[in-house]
């Protein structure tokens, strides 16, 4: 088999025609990157290399995932004689997977004379550009259409060597050089019409397996020169063994003990140490909506619940800024944790013309909606006139008090004349420090808050000269009746510290939608949660008793074992192959006949969709 098991992988480059240092430095860099390399993950760029350099170390390369750029070099031949595949996952100049340009020295005889890509039989994506290589021969004798998978692309080949020897007579007019060993191996244009990919001969039974790339030595997926998709221990497969497989006993997808991860075009049991697992791939870094976690010693990307954690430097002591202002507000975008403090001073809100800082656009304060934790203190001495609460901090859960303001304060709110309620609806802990809330002339509701419940130690409060409690009550500025006795941060059922009855997504309600309403719910403690979308709504009765698809009273679509499902399993990977089921008259999922390969409408062999396997052949697993 040409498809090996373990392969030396190296990173490519993305420099284009830019180079750093002299020719010697270029060569050393190239040698360091590609010595003993078999698969280039990225682009192979060979630019400005001298004729004196020994490039024989490149002959180990069998595959390049991106593009190949050969430009402005003066060596005579390119020792990529074992290169089989260019995948073209990235293009040069937006459409080329192989780009060869200006490889000659106008003042000397040194030039590229032969490509030497004798084993190149597949370019999976992208085109070919070979121009202005004054002495380069045997590029127009290559049948590029046999190599390029995309039939719509025209190779751009011209203005290269003119005085070239013909192909050897044994080559049939297609070659990489003048000798009999330079004949081009055709693996596509010579195939019988029955072959839908490549072939190893002209006969109808000499087709390569459809997972092969570049050709093969025989019909099996282990006979490929290279893999179209992934190489799994020497076999070419459309997907690496997936992380989840269907368990026919539990009717659920469960972790696959034999899972492998995609590392480029190779299936590996574990990712290289500097990579993390994202679903079933090895990636350098998690995407922006996921965060890196370690599970059983495995570094994985997990979707963040809401925004991914992002820690940002605050203001005040030990920081670059004294206050939040128009010059720094944008640095708080998507922050979930403030390392330090937040200070809101009049110079920040109104601006400081002497320091060329404009007034703060009050709308921009909404950036703080993502903040869940402040490790130091929160100090609000100035607030926009039209904003009557601090609801931009409605997701703030913890004030750490690791650094304190003035006489030991971790929460200080003073002289904000227009503020009528605090609106800190998620605040559940003031870990250390004192609370100072004074001289906010219109501020109500704060007397209702059980501050002792927020503080780890005895609450040390300095709360005075706000609107008198009696006046607030007279004006009806009291907690919503759905709030418990713990108090509230402001008006309405969304501002309660806790609820008298039930809560739904942070809002207090009389009751959950157990038996009526558009969306049905169940309760966990006093919290209402929606039933699984696969549960059928039961009129006048309980729709579900938990969150899973196995807690429904009735199914909206089909039932597979205890689980309500949108459709019965169709080709889901099981322990021993794909699994197919059909729904019976009572909408229960039942297994297809064991020889069905594309699903079925009933349990019998004649109910199979598409072709069934002949009885003698190994069938996919069904249950």
């Amino acid at each position: 088999s040409e498809v090996g098991n373990s392969q030396a992988v190296c990173a490519g480059t993305l420099n284009g025609l830019s180079v750093t240092g002299d020719a010697q430095h270029q060569y050393r860099t190239l040698h360091k990157m590609y010595n003993n390399c078999e698969i280039v993950m990225g682009n192979l760029e060979i630019v400005l290399i001298d004729h004196t350099q020994d490039l024989s170390f490149l002959q180990t390369i069998r595959e390049v995932t991106g593009y190949i750029l050969i430009a402005m070099n003066v060596f005579s031949t390119l020792p990529l004689r074992n290169l089989r595949v260019i995948r073209g996952t990235q293009f040069y100049e937006e459409k080329y997977a192989l780009f060869v340009l200006l490889n000659y020295n106008p003042n000397a005889t040194h030039a590229l004379r032969q490509l030497g890509l004798n084993r190149l039989t597949e370019i999976l994506a992208g085109g070919v550009y070979i121009e202005k290589n004054e002495q380069l021969c045997h590029v127009d004798t290559v049948e590029w259409r046999d190599i390029m998978r995309d039939p719509r692309l025209e190779p751009v080949v011209g203005d290269n060597g003119r005085a070239c020897a013909p192909c050897h007579e044994s080559c049939g007019g297609h070659c990489w050089g003048p000798g009999p060993e330079d004949c081009q191996q055709l693996t596509k244009t010579i195939c019988a019409p029955q072959c839908n990919g490549r072939c190893f001969g002209r006969a109808p039974n000499e087709c390569c397996h459809e997972e092969c790339a570049g050709g093969c030595t025989g019909p099996l997926q282990t006979h490929c020169f290279a893999c179209r998709h992934f190489n799994d221990s020497g076999a070419c497969v459309p997907l690496c063994p997936q992380p989840l497989i269907y368990n026919k006993l539990t009717f659920q997808l469960e972790p696959n003990p034999d899972t492998k991860y995609q590392y480029g075009s190779v299936c590996v049991r574990s990712c290289p140490h500097n990579f993390v697992v994202d679903q079933s791939s090895c990636v350098r870094a998690c995407p922006s909506n996921k965060m890196e976690v370690e599970k059983n010693g495995l570094k994985m990307c997990e979707p963040c619940a809401g925004l991914c954690p992002k820690a940002c430097e605050g203001t005040g002591a030990g920081s670059h800024y004294q206050t939040v202002d128009s010059s720094n507000i944008d640095s708080f975008v998507n922050c979930t944790k403030i390392l330090g403090n937040l200070d809101f001073l009049i110079t920040g809100l109104e601006g400081d013309p002497w320091r060329n800082i404009s007034a703060l656009d009050p709308e921009k304060l909404n950036v703080f909606r993502t903040v869940r934790e402040i490790t130091g203190y929160l100090n609000i001495q100035s607030w926009p006139k039209h904003m009557h609460n601090f609801s931009v901090f409605s997701n703030l859960e913890t004030i750490g008090g690791r650094s304190l303001y003035n006489r030991g304060f971790s929460l200080l709110i003073m002289k904000n004349d227009n503020v009528t309620s605090l609106g800190l609806r998620s605040l559940r802990e003031v870990s250390a420090g004192r609370v100072y809330i004074t001289e906010n002339r219109r501020l109500c509701y704060l007397h209702t808050v059980q501050w002792a419940a927020l503080s780890r130690r005895r609450a040390d409060l300095d709360i005075r000269n706000n609107k008198p409690r009696g006046k607030c009550q007279q004006e009806g500025k009291v907690c919503d009746p759905l709030c418990s006795a713990d108090g509230c941060w402001g008006p309405g059922p969304a501002q309660c510290l806790s609820c008298r009855h039930y809560s739904r997504r942070g809002v207090c309600v009389e009751s959950c939608s157990f038996t009526q309403g558009e969306t049905r719910e169940f309760a966990e403690g006093t919290e209402c949660f929606e039933c699984h979308p696969e549960c059928e709504r039961v009129e006048g009765g309980i729709t579900c008793n938990g969150s899973g698809a196995d807690t429904c009273t009735r199914c909206a679509h089909y039932r597979d074992g205890p689980h309500c499902v949108e459709r019965c399993p169709e080709g889901i990977l099981g322990e021993r192959g794909p699994i197919y089921k059909y729904p019976d008259s009572s909408r229960e999922c039942r297994p297809c006949h064991e020889n069905c390969t594309r699903g079925c409408t009933g349990p019998l062999l004649q109910d199979c969709l598409g072709d069934a396997l002949p009885s003698a052949r190994r069938a996919p697993t069904v249950i």
């Epitope: 400081d352 003035n406 001289e439």
Partner: nanobody
């Protein structure tokens, strides 16, 4: 360039009075709490009085309560410290300072919370 310039210091007999002025430039005076500090030879700098930027709330150290009065004129970008019934122990270099942090009840603006400082003016109370 930010500047705070103190004036009005001098030699005065015990029981006498002085009025210190602090003229500010280079920043938005109205937004800043103004504080007066003093430092006697061989002693640490101590807070004497401060006045809020917004509502004129003022703070006085126990040692000067009833004798000193702080005021400000935002139109003139100037703060004042009227010192009556002066005592020999009031002898010190008096500094004015400006803080973007506001002063409030029960707060005392500490030395490190002031952004800008003047050079100081000498007050000597002696017979």
């Amino acid at each position: 360039e930010v500047q705070l310039v103190e004036s009005g210091g001098g030699l005065v007999q015990p029981g006498g009075s002085l009025r210190l002025s602090c003229a500010a430039s280079g920043f938005t005076f109205d937004y800043y709490t103004i504080g007066w500090f003093r430092q006697a030879p061989g002693k640490e700098r101590e807070g004497v009085s401060c006045i809020s930027s917004r509502d004129g709330d003022s703070y006085y150290a126990d040692s000067v309560k009833g004798r000193f009065t702080i005021s400000r004129d935002n139109a003139k970008n100037t703060a004042y410290l009227q010192m009556n019934s002066l005592k020999p122990e009031d002898t010190a270099v008096y500094y004015c300072a400006a803080s973007a942090s506001d002063y409030g009840l029960g707060l005392e603006l500490f030395h490190d919370e002031y952004n800008y400082w003047g050079q100081g003016t000498q007050v000597t109370v002696s017979s």
